[in-house]
Amino acid sequence: YDFTNCDFEKIKAAYLSTISKDLITYMSGTKSTEFNNTVSCSNRPHCLTEIQSLTFNPTAGCASLAKEMFAMKTKAALAIWCPGYSETQINATQAMKKRRKRKVTTNKCLEQVSQLQGLWRRFNRPLLKQQ
């Protein structure tokens, strides 16, 4: 999906009002400097691409993020403020339902959410170029 035509300010507002709190809740108990920042993004569409990938694509050691509160709110924000986004996600959602797993917070998931916090922080930068 091409995130170029999203309403970035509306997504930013959704992040600041709720998603950020949910990410903080998920990370509760984690040491500040436990994880290095290794994922980056250069502009807002790129940031959303990386955020979507880390939030919804299962990775080795972390298959359970899509059912977390921050993920569901991220999905809702993208569906509302990115034209055509929800249509591209129908197949992905069906596949996810088939492989639903028990929610387990692994160290790998915590590391992944730490990276997500960094990506969201970059997305919110006022001077980050749109394109």
């Epitope: 903080i24 500040s32 970059r122």
Partner: antibody, heavy 118, light 107 residues
């Protein structure tokens, strides 16, 4: 182990600028955010701003915007905080402090006293 | 910005006493609160993060609790080295803010 070593005390006149340094060691400099916090005599701690050394992006407390500049020298693993148009109320101890993506401060510099006096 | 108000601002106590310091936030900060101890002429030292997690090397007599808008730091049995100023800090929301401090003095 992580160490943050700051430059020495400074005495400045009102209207002048001051630049405080913070040399980091014991970790990969680009991995974490560097913050600056100050404490005026008898006052609460006040967050000034932060820099991401990986791309030098800065965020500042609204109260300091326009007067503060935070920079890094990657080759020296050193962060700098420059405050301009100094006034007597800027007399304070200035600290550098380190965080990851979660913003509480588990490592601090020893502090630099900046005195603004005519 | 989120305002943090500590109470009391000054506290006199004796070695062996149990003391509690309260930190109230002007809005919900989940559990994103840290507590620091500061002695004169020294940098603050992290004691508690995530409202209740003790930092490495912090004695078990220090404990934290709370969520939402009300948080407490408890020292179960005061030791001579505990007389200092204590600050809470919220990191739920930009800009990061601190309480005004609680100075703990020997009675």
């Amino acid at each position: 182990q992580v160490q943050l070593v700051q430059s020495g005390a400074e005495v400045k006149k009102p209207g002048a600028s001051v630049k405080v340094s913070c040399k980091a060691s014991g970790y990969t400099f680009t991995s974490y955010l560097m913050h600056w916090v100050r404490q005026a005599p008898g006052q609460r701690l006040e967050w000034i701003g932060e820099i991401d050394p990986s791309d030098s992006y800065t965020d500042y407390n609204q109260n300091f915007r326009g007067r503060v500049t935070i920079t890094v020298d990657m080759s020296a693993s050193t962060a700098y905080m420059e405050l301009s148009s100094l006034r007597s109320e800027d007399t304070a101890v200035y600290y550098c402090a380190l965080t990851g993506t979660i913003n509480y401060f588990d490592y601090w510099g020893q502090g630099t006293l900046v005195t603004v006096s005519s | 910005d989120i305002q943090l108000t500590q109470s009391p601002s000054f506290l006199s106590a004796s070695v062996g006493d149990r003391v509690t310091i309260t930190c109230k936030a002007s809005q919900d900060v989940v559990t994103a609160v840290a507590w620091y101890q500061q002695k004169p002429g020294k940098a603050p030292k992290l004691l508690i993060y995530w409202a209740s997690m003790r930092h490495t090397g912090v004695p078990s007599r220090f404990s934290g609790s709370g969520s939402g808008t009300e948080f407490t730091l408890t020292i179960s049995s005061l030791q001579p080295e505990d007389f200092a100023t204590y600050y809470c800090q919220q990191y739920s929301s930009f800009t990061f803010t601190f309480g005004q401090g609680t100075k703990l003095e020997i009675k």
